[in-house]
């Protein structure tokens, strides 16, 4: 068995974020069994979890993980120092902020310590695997009789993010959504004062600093409308 998915030269968006190589073997044995794929996500560039499906192994196996950065000053092979476990079997590795280099090619190697020839290596572009924390501190301002402005904060460099706002009224069956750039504000020009509105936001590390496909979790919703506070109609922020 010799599986190689090579990344062609060119654009990130036309290639996989990894390629996988499996050590060739001379005879069919346990070492021909493919190792599970490693999936890594960088959470708000605070830590990274690289995980694999430990239950895909034919028998419980404490697979080991090594990593390094290709063609860089950080190309020394590192052992995982903080394993994640599933039912007492290794199922992942957590790397801390100081070990994360977003703009260098991350190489991760999974190995069966009982069968050292059984190993798989993947290359990952970490800037495409960043997931920010959900937006926080949603606030609504009434700009005029019929116009609302929604603002929020991110625990992140704003220029690196894009956002998706969803809103609906109690009369709606589905959400209306609007893409928003790094400026983290959204205006709704026409608000019906007889309806109650719900807004929520999520964010993504895209496009200036990376090409992440995964969105953050949704923010806590915020509400505005017929049964909200009468005391200060010009500034209102209410958690669900």
């Amino acid at each position: 068995l010799n599986t190689t998915i090579l990344t062609p030269n060119g654009n990130e968006d036309t290639t996989a974020d990894f390629f996988l190589t499996t050590m060739p073997t001379d005879s069919l044995s346990v070492s021909t069994l493919p190792l599970p794929e490693v999936q890594c996500f960088v959470f708000n560039v605070e830590y990274m979890n690289c995980t694999w499906n430990s239950s895909s192994e034919p028998q419980p196996t404490n697979l080991t993980l090594h990593y390094w950065y290709k063609n860089s000053d950080n190309d020394k092979v590192q052992k995982c120092s903080h394993y994640l476990f599933s039912e007492e079997i290794t199922s992942g590795c957590q790397l801390q902020k100081k070990e994360i280099h977003l703009y260098q090619t991350f190489v991760v190697q999974l190995q069966d310590p009982r069968e050292p020839r059984r190993q798989a290596t993947q290359m990952l572009k970490l800037q495409n695997l960043v997931i920010p924390w959900a937006p926080e501190n949603l606030t609504l301002h009434k700009l005029s009789e019929s116009q609302l402005e929604l603002n929020w904060n991110n625990r992140f460099l704003n220029h690196c993010l894009e956002h998706l706002v969803q809103y609906r009224t109690d009369w709606d069956h589905s959400w209306t959504e609007q893409s928003v750039d790094y400026r983290h504000k959204f205006s709704l020009p026409s608000v019906d004062g007889q309806k109650r509105y719900t807004f929520r936001v999520r964010s993504r590390f895209n496009p200036l600093c990376g090409s992440a496909q995964h969105w953050s979790e949704w923010s806590h919703p915020i509400h505005w409308g017929s049964n909200t506070s009468k005391e200060n109609p010009f500034l209102f922020a209410l958690e669900a």
Partner: nanobody, 117 residues
Framework: QVQLQESGGGLVQAGGSLRLSCAAS????????MGWYRQAPGRQRELVAR???????YYSTSVKGRFTISRDNAKNTLYLQMNSLKPEDTAVYYC???????????WGQGTLVTVSS
């Protein structure tokens, strides 16, 4: 504070070429990601291209195959070679830089590119 200064913009006919430069006030080897974005009047900003310190580049679909981004760490300069220009490429082009820590986002004053038909 990092200063980035763009140059090379101007008026060009459709099908023509321009080369934009972005000079940095510090060693760009310390800037892990550099790129170009553009903004046309009344439009949201749009990523054009970006390149890591290791030379790994990315292009938006609208410019892929026509534009080439490169960086010269010895000259502390980022470049954008623009070929086969189209009227819809008309915009102010900004260069930007981001350290790996994401502690800051640096960008320049911009240079205007006008493509006439």
């Amino acid at each position: 504070q990092v200063q980035l200064q763009e140059s090379g913009g101007g008026l060009v006919q459709a099908g023509g070429s321009l080369r934009l430069s972005c000079a940095a006030s510090i060693s760009i080897s310390k800037i892990d990601l550099m790129g170009w974005y553009r903004q046309a009047p009344g439009r949201q900003r749009e990523l054009v291209a970006r390149v890591t310190n290791g030379g790994d580049s990315y292009y938006s679909t609208s410019v892929k195959g026509r534009f080439t981004i490169s960086r010269d760490n010895a000259k502390n300069t980022l470049y954008l070679q623009m070929n086969s220009l189209k009227p819809e490429d008309t915009a102010v082009y900004y260069c930007y830089g981001v350290p790996e820590s994401l502690a800051a986002f640096h960008w320049g004053q911009g240079t205007l590119v006008t493509v006439s038909s």
